[in-house]
Structure formats: C-alpha cells, structure tokens
C-alpha cells in the first residue's frame, strides 16, 4: 500500500508511517515501528505536558516565587501547569502572573467600583453628584451625601465629591 501523507487526529507522520501521539502527561521516548506502538513515559515530578504530543521533554511546572508576592492557586499535575496568584492585597501584573504589585487605592473623590482580586487591580470611579469619598482606599465605595431633610435639618454647607454635606438646624421664623 501507498505510504500515508497525512494521519488521523492524535497521530503524527514519521518515516512514512502514522504513529500515535503520546497522551497528555506523557513524553515521547521512541517512535512507533511497523511492529510496535509509540513508546511514551509519564512526565516526572514537577513536570507536565498538556496536549497530545511528540515532545521528548516535559515542561517544568511554573514556580510561584514568594519573593515576587506569588503563591500557588492550583498545584500542577502531569497534565496541567501550576497556576499562581498573588498574596492578599496584591495582584498579577500580567495574564501569565509572573509577578505581583500592590492593589491601587482610590483617591479622595473616587470610590471603588470593583474590588481587586489576585489577578485584577482595583477599579475606581469618580464619585457622581450626590456621593463623596474623603479617604484613599482600596475597599471604600463612594458614600451618598447625608440627607439633611430626613433629619429635619437643612444643608448648611454643600457637599462635594470629596466631602459630605454639612447639616444644621432650620432657622426659626420669628412671630
């Protein structure tokens, strides 16, 4: 029969024959022959391969370096890489999470729209009219101005995006 020019899924072409790829978690030791299957071996400790492959070496698991603020979120297996995340109060600088930076705080006049996670920074938003923030914080949202009316008081000093309104007693009408 004619030697194949293409192979099925999970196979590869070598020396005019189709050999099975090694399954995830295993590396190639020797190609198949006319008589025998592909020779594969499992990846060693701290190694992985996440696809059907013909790699002769497994990849090393990622190291979550505590000196860079990293910790293990999910331990790697022979088929998956280790997933790193950042220590509390820090977040990854990239999708690959190779290092961490401190969560940013929202300045006065801005509130937290979305609290930071291990992989995303704090998202701040300007306090709209009727709201304020007078602190620099990674957690605090914009607070609504105090409603003087509900306390039977009147506004003595208008609020800003950084300050609350100041309420005072109503002027008594003299008889």
């Amino acid at each position: 029969p004619e030697p194949p020019t293409a192979c099925r899924e999970k196979q590869y072409l070598i020396n005019s024959q189709c050999c099975s790829l090694c399954q995830p978690g295993q590396k190639l030791v020797s190609d198949c022959t006319e008589f025998t299957e592909t020779e594969c071996l499992p990846c060693g400790e701290s190694e992985f391969l996440d696809t059907w492959n013909r790699e002769t070496h497994c990849h090393q698991h990622k190291y979550c370096d505590p000196n860079l603020g990293l910790r293990v979120q999910q331990k790697g297996t022979s088929e998956t890489d280790t997933i790193c995340t950042c220590e509390e109060g820090w977040h990854c600088t990239s999708e690959a999470c190779e290092s961490c930076v401190l969560h940013r705080s929202c300045s006065p006049g801005f509130g937290v729209k979305q609290i930071a996670t291990g992989v995303s920074d704090t998202i701040c938003e300007p306090c709209p009219v009727g709201f304020f923030s007078n602190v620099s914080s990674a957690f605090e949202k914009c607070h609504p101005w105090t409603s003087c009316e509900t306390k039977d008081l009147v506004v003595q000093q208008a609020g800003t995006n950084k300050t609350d309104v100041v309420c005072g007693p109503q002027d008594r009408l003299r008889a």
Epitope: N15, V29, S30, D31, G44, T56, H57
Partner: antibody
Framework: EVQLEESGGGLVQPGGSLRLSCAAS????????MSWVRQAPGKGPEWVVT?????????YYASWAKGRFTISKDTSKTTLYLQMNSLRAEDTATYFC?????????WGQGTLVTVSS | DIVMTQSPSSLSASVGDRVTITCQAS??????LSWYQQKPGQAPKLLIY???TLPSGVPSRFSGSGSGTDFTLTISSLQPEDFATYYC??????????????FGQGTKVVIK
C-alpha cells in the same frame, strides 16, 4: 531499510580504551531513545546505558558502568557511540546497540569486545 | 539498580506443551516489562512489551501478564521454532533523576 550496525569492537588489553559506533538507518534517529546492551559469552543480556531522544537527551547508566563508560550521539551522522575506558577482562562481551528504552524494538548484530593480555 | 529474577533457568518440554515462565522485579515497575526470545548467534528479538502487548507479527500463542513486581510469559502450544532462550527486561521509571533497566537471567526451553 531500518537497521542498526555496530562497529569498533576488537581485542584490547586490560586498562585500555575502545570506542564503539552504531550507525542507524531507516528511522528518525533524533526522536528515539537508544541503548547499549552487552552479552558475555554464554550469559544473558546486560543493560549498559540509555540515552533519551531530543537534542539534550538525558542519559542513564547501569551503576557498574558509571565513570568508565560514556554514551553519546551525533544526530547529523545518525550514529550512537559508546566510549569505554579502563577496560577489564569481565567487560569481554558482544555489545549491541538497540532502539528504545522501556522495550527494545530493534537490535544490531553486535560487535565483539575481547579484553585480554 | 533494579534486579529481575527469572524462573525456571531451564525447562524441557514437548511440541504442543503449555509453557509458563515467571519474572519478578525487585521493586514495582508498573507494566514496564518486556520479553525477548534469543536463538544462538542472534540478537534478542522483542516478543512482548508493556507486560502484555504483542508486536505485530508475533504469534498469538505467546502471551504476557502481570503488573507491579510479578510477571508471566505463557506459550500456549509450543512449536518447534520456539525452542530458544527467553529473557525478561524490567524498566524502573523513577520520574525524577534515575531510571534503570535490567534483564532476567534467562530461561532456556529445550526439547524433552
């Protein structure tokens, strides 16, 4: 044709050195582990060393072979080598190269090494 | 290094007999066990690999079984061309820094 052919054997004095070669043909040399196995006259096969596939193939030696024997390969020449130093009478054997590691799918015809004074 | 202990060292049998050879590894080797047949003046020939897989072209009268430390080669009905010496080969895979392989001492199958 898929084959392995050893060469370089012969008579050597105790303490001497010898380099065996194994020429591979008919298959992809770079993606196959290769092993050396020896067989003393009238005895069973004895594993010597294995070199894994890939450019920086890791090597594993039988404990008795460490330090005296060295495996290497030249992918461009599709040739496997076994450098043997400080040879002793008990190293007298037919030396085979074979394709594979956990199982040996293809063997050469062997080359005889005789260590004698 | 791993040690493979094969038994018996020799056996005499007749054509048509069922023959069983055993092999024991000094430590668990999963299913990394192969069997070879060798005839005088020839290199060993792979007969079974991964404990129980037959290479294509090897007659189905040969079979292998076992896992861990204990393995068996069976020839269901001995044929004239089967008179030879049989060797097991165990491969110890550490997954870290050191792998080793070893052969059994052999079983010579002779005509009764």
């Amino acid at each position: 044709e898929v084959q392995l052919e050893e060469s370089g054997g012969g008579l050597v004095q105790p303490g001497g050195s010898l380099r065996l070669s194994c020429a591979a043909s008919g298959f992809s040399f770079s993606s196959n582990a290769m092993s050396w196995v020896r067989q003393a006259p009238g005895k069973g096969p004895e594993w010597v060393v294995t070199i894994y596939a890939g450019s920086s193939g890791s090597t594993y030696y039988a404990s008795w072979a460490k330090g005296r024997f060295t495996i290497s390969k030249d992918t461009s020449k599709t040739t496997l080598y076994l450098q043997m130093n400080s040879l002793r009478a008990e190293d007298t054997a037919t030396y085979f190269c074979a394709r594979g590691a956990t199982y040996l799918t293809l063997w050469g015809q062997g080359t005889l090494v005789t260590v004698s004074s | 290094d791993i040690v493979m202990t094969q038994s018996p060292s020799s056996l005499s049998a007749s054509v048509g007999d069922r023959v069983t050879i055993t092999c024991q590894a000094s430590q668990s080797i999963s299913n990394y066990l192969s069997w070879y047949q060798q005839k005088p003046g020839q290199a060993p020939k792979l007969l079974i690999y991964r404990a129980s897989t037959l290479p294509s072209g090897v007659p189905s009268r040969f079979s292998g079984s076992g896992s861990g430390t204990d393995f068996t080669l069976t020839i269901s009905s001995l044929q004239p061309e089967d008179f030879a010496t049989y060797y097991c080969q165990g491969y110890y895979y550490s997954g870290t820094t050191y792998d080793s392989t070893a052969f059994g001492q052999g079983t010579k199958v002779v005509i009764k």
